[in-house]
Amino acid sequence: YDFTNCDFEKIKAAYLSTISKDLITYMSGTKSTEFNNTVSCSNRPHCLTEIQSLTFNPTAGCASLAKEMFAMKTKAALAIWCPGYSETQINATQAMKKRRKRKVTTNKCLEQVSQLQGLWRRFNRPLLKQQ
């Protein structure tokens, strides 16, 4: 999916109002310095591409974050403010359904959500030069 045509300001507002807080809730009890940010993004569409991938694609050690509250609200925001996004999700979700097991918070999942927080922060500062 090409995130170029999303309403970035509305997604940012939703992130600041609620998604960010759900990410913090997920990470509660974890030190902010515990994980190094290894995933980066260069502009807002690229950030959303990486956020989409880390949030909804299963990875080794973290089968799926897709059922978490922050993920559901992320999906809703992308669907509402990125034209055509909801139509692209069918195959990905069908593949995920067999793998879902909610509330198994592994260290790998915590690391992945820490990366997500970094991507979202970068999304909110689009004018900063890439480090």
């Epitope: 509305k10 939703a14 109002s17 759900d22 809730t25 809703a76 669907a79 509402i80 909801s86 979700t93």
Partner: antibody, heavy 121, light 108 residues
Framework: QVQLQQSGADLVRPGSSVKISCKTS????????MNWVKQRPGQGLEWIGQ????????NYNGKFKDKATLTADKSSSTVYMQLSSLTSEDSAVYFC??????????????WGQGTSVTVSS | EIVLTQSPALMAASPGEKVTIICSVS???????LHWYQQKSETSPKPWIY???NLASGVPVRFSGSGSGTSYSLTISSMEAEDAATYYC?????????FGSGTKLEIK
């Protein structure tokens, strides 16, 4: 404008099933999670579950996992809830509700008028 | 699951009286995830206050909401007859979504 129109009242026999509908209009149906809420006579509100019509993803309240089945038909912008093995405990008004961002916080922002289901022999 | 306890369950207020309804949450949630709905008999619930303190469209300014963590409240600065209804708090912090048991507010 956003509208959620639910099917009419149902009188059903114990042990049977019922399927109630919620026809939507005025918004991009595939992009919004749709919720179902139960209210027994004189009682409070109880969340049953939600469906995302874009891909059919569902989240259920564990209490209703074996009772309710949520589906969506994108061609008619309608969500459905089937209730099975009905008992008197299932006699209630059932509401559909859209979830969306209002003031950029996430909540149930539009509600259907409710469907009354009465289970009686 | 997160349990929301409302108090009082039933109350009556005179016109012009200040009214406060409390919603206690069993585990701490962020303010953006606490909402209030108004329901009058035989009708569907209406969104009333979003994210602890944001009034829904059309809600009179005599209503306000506040709170954080495990304690939230809805306040009416000056009770009017049209405010007689049942008010429910609801959390969107974790699944399953849950509602408070409701506060029925009557006019004296």
């Amino acid at each position: 404008q956003v509208q959620l129109q639910q099917s009419g009242a149902d009188l059903v026999r114990p042990g049977s099933s019922v399927k109630i509908s919620c026809k939507t209009s005025g918004f991009a149906f595939s992009s919004y999670y749709m919720n179902w809420v139960k209210q027994r006579p004189g009682q409070g509100l109880e969340w049953i579950g939600q469906i995302y019509p874009g891909d059919g993803e569902t989240n259920y309240n564990g209490k209703f996992k074996d009772k309710a089945t949520l589906t969506a038909d994108k061609s008619s912008s309608t969500v459905y809830m089937q209730l099975s093995s009905l008992t008197s405990e299932d006699s209630a008004v059932y509401f559909c509700a859209r979830a969306g961002y209002s003031d950029y916080v996430y909540a149930m922002d539009y509600w259907g008028q409710g469907t009354s289901v009465t289970v009686s022999s | 699951e997160i349990v929301l306890t409302q108090s009082p369950a039933l109350m009556a207020a005179s016109p012009g009286e200040k009214v406060t309804i409390i919603c206690s949450v069993s585990s701490s949630i962020t303010s953006s995830n606490l909402h209030w709905y108004q329901q009058k008999s035989e009708t569907s619930p209406k969104p009333w206050i979003y994210g602890t303190s944001n009034l829904a469209s059309g809600v009179p300014v005599r209503f306000s909401g506040s709170g954080s963590g495990t304690s939230y409240s809805l306040t009416i600065s000056s009770m009017e007859a049209e405010d007689a209804a049942t008010y429910y708090c609801q959390q969107w912090s974790s699944f399953p979504l849950t509602f408070g048991s409701g506060t029925k507010l009557e006019i004296k």
